[in-house]
Interface confidence: medium
Amino acid sequence: QPDAINAPVTCCYNFTNRKISVQRLASYRRITSSKCPKEAVIFKTIVAKEICADPKQKWVQDSMDHLDKQIQTPKP
């Protein structure tokens, strides 16, 4: 889970080791701050949990692409 140190900077120290289905994801944000030990993606899930993921993993990249497309194509 993400950890806020000296808010507003939020850092990830561990990544999830389980793929999360895109059907359970609501949004994401990238963590690129030099104050954090590693680059990360924080997914927000449909049940409001925030999960740290490794941006180098393919499923993470695919999930971000999927969420980007959802934003670009609003539901009628």
């Epitope: 389980r18 793929k19 999360i20 289905s21 059907q23 359970r24 899930t45 449909i46 049940v47 409001a48 949990k49 999960i51």
Partner: antibody, heavy 119, light 108 residues
């Protein structure tokens, strides 16, 4: 260690309601969901519905829609399942089970509550 | 709703034999969100496998799961006396969640 403790056996008349409780200990209650699953005598498992306290979501199987209400009280770490308009076919063991809201496998189960519907 | 069909309904085997249980879904279970449970008489079900192939904590290595999409398998490599029970598959990608009807593994 996570433990789910359910209320005791009930005998009910047809047409009445039953409310089964499921008290959780050993985990962060609001971070998890609770599913309710029933098992009629000699039959398989049947998913009834679920609640995710963190998001306030409830989901019900269509078969039970309108007859079942699942609630949760975070202050006591207790989930409840109320089934109304009982009929003899509702005689079953009712289980609560915990799931992680992100995923969904049922990793911890209550001991079960036998509900007998008989006139 | 996703219908899960388990086969066979009953499997009669001897201790030490290999058990192969099948679970077929009526539509794809995305991201392999499928679990297997073991249930013994008078007891609550116990989680064995989640995400189709990951063993739950404390589950012996003789239990393994495989499959994706619509076809899933639970394998018990060498049956121990305590493995004779009913096994259920469960999909948790969609609401409503659904269970298979169960496979009973009995002593031959």
């Amino acid at each position: 260690q996570v433990e789910l403790v359910q209320s005791g056996a009930e005998v009910k008349k047809p047409g009445s309601s039953v409310k089964v409780s499921c008290k959780a200990s050993g985990g962060t209650f609001s971070s998890y969901g609770i599913s309710w699953v029933r098992q009629a005598p000699g039959q398989g498992l049947e998913w009834m519905g679920a609640i995710n306290p963190l998001a306030g979501h409830t989901h019900y199987a269509q078969k039970f829609q309108g007859r079942v209400t699942i609630t949760a009280d975070e202050s006591t770490s207790t989930a409840y399942m109320e089934l109304s308009s009982l009929r003899s076919e509702d005689t079953a063991v009712y289980y609560c089970a915990r799931y992680d809201g992100i995923y969904g496998e049922l990793d911890f189960w209550g001991q079960g509550t036998l509900v007998t519907v008989s006139s | 709703d996703i219908v899960l069909t388990q086969s066979p309904a009953t499997l009669s085997l001897s201790p030490g034999e290999r058990a192969t249980l099948s679970c077929r879904a009526s539509q794809s279970v995305s991201d392999a969100y499928l679990a297997w449970y073991q249930q013994k008489p008078g007891q609550a079900p116990r989680l064995l496998i989640y995400d189709a192939s990951s063993r739950a904590t404390g589950v012996p290595a003789r239990f393994s799961g495989s499959g994706s999409g619509t076809d899933f398998t639970l394998t018990i490599s060498s049956l121990e006396p305590e493995d004779f029970a009913v096994y259920y598959c469960h999909q948790y990608i969609f609401y409503p969640n659904t269970f298979g009807q169960g496979t009973k593994v009995e002593i031959k």
